[in-house]
């Protein structure tokens, strides 16, 4: 067990996205049971959900969550003010925009109120845990006889996002994908006018403003071109 105890002004540092510590215990008891890991995601920098698997507890337990920001002006310990519940047991905490400081190290502490010594602390880099909303308002423009341009919008600062475009025709078994930087536009230079194309896009908070690994949900698809191939076996799967 790692028995480091973090305090709001501690000097511990780590390059990982999270760092887990547990309180030391003197004897075998319920205190030695590990607490579930807390997973936090910042949704579009509008709110953050920090959740844990409440069913991993041996008996239903309303675990409590405290948080602070390490080595910052916001290092005062805060209690969760908006718990999330699963079957009437606490399973998460929602923090609002004003409580989110992306570029300070976020420290989250989970505790069993019946066994105060049973607690676990994690340090998180919130700029790596941002998940943007799915791209919206996909539009297609014909640049020339055979060239299409796809544009979209994000409810976010566009320069902070990179994008992944996927497209395929009704005759394709799989998607073709292309990475797109913050410019949020994509050109397909050679379009077959006899085929029907489907496009979709997702976005990620990377690399300029953070280093998130998680993508947004896919956008609603947008279609272009002929829709006459009734015997095409992939058409219906595509629409599902």
């Amino acid at each position: 067990l790692n028995t480091t105890i973090l305090t709001p002004n501690g000097n511990e540092d780590t390059t990982a996205d999270f760092f887990l510590t547990t309180m030391p215990t003197d004897s075998l008891s319920v205190s030695t049971l590990p607490l579930p890991e807390v997973q936090c995601f910042v949704f579009n920098v509008e709110y953050m959900n920090c959740t844990w698997n409440s069913s991993s507890e041996p008996q239903p337990t309303n675990l409590t969550l405290h948080y602070w920001y390490k080595n910052s002006d916001n290092d005062k310990v805060q209690k969760c003010s908006h718990y999330l519940f699963s079957e009437e047991i606490t399973s998460g905490c929602q923090l609002q925009k004003k409580e989110i400081h992306l570029y300070q190290t976020f420290v989250v502490q989970l505790q069993d109120p019946r066994e105060p010594r049973r607690q676990a602390t994690q340090m998180l880099k919130l700029q790596n845990l941002v998940i943007p909303w799915a791209p919206e308002n996909l539009t297609l423009h014909k640049l020339s006889e055979s060239q299409l341009e796809l544009n979209w919008n994000n409810r976010f600062l566009n320069h902070c996002l990179e994008h992944l475009v996927q497209y395929r025709t009704d005759w394709d078994h799989s998607w073709t994908e292309q990475s797109v930087d913050y410019r949020h536009k994509f050109s397909l230079p050679s379009v077959d006018g006899q085929k029907r194309y489907t496009f979709r896009v997702r976005s990620r908070f990377n690399p300029l403003c953070g280093s998130a690994q998680h993508w947004s949900e896919w956008s609603h698809p947008i279609h272009w071109g002929s829709n006459t191939s009734k015997e095409n076996p992939f058409l219906f799967a595509l629409e599902a």
Epitope: L102, Q104, C160, L208, C209
Partner: nanobody, 127 residues
Amino acid sequence: QVQLQESGGGSVQAGGSLRLSCVASGYTFSSYCMGWFRQAPGKEREGVAALGGGSTYYADSVKGRFTISQDNAKNTLYLQMNSLKPEDTAMYYCAAAWVACLEFGGSWYDLARYKHWGQGTQVTVSS
């Protein structure tokens, strides 16, 4: 490829002045935050001053003595340091962000806010 190159450091007597420059290539000055940080031996890197979106920000320890400015035409960030003290001795770094100085909460001096860093220029102030 963003590159930041600092210059202007050196040795000076207490009470003297220095002007640091940071030339940015591959990075366009705008409302994004650019800052000066410093790191003395055995100490953590700390914010000195930052500029972005028409606002300037200073650490309490340098207010009234240091001035941050930029020349958009030259794509250069400056730090004019007057009334220097021995405790100003440190390696000074220029840093550039892709967000505004206070965007997404927190403070202008949050190190993680800045994506790009220069190699640093040494400032030594003797008494």
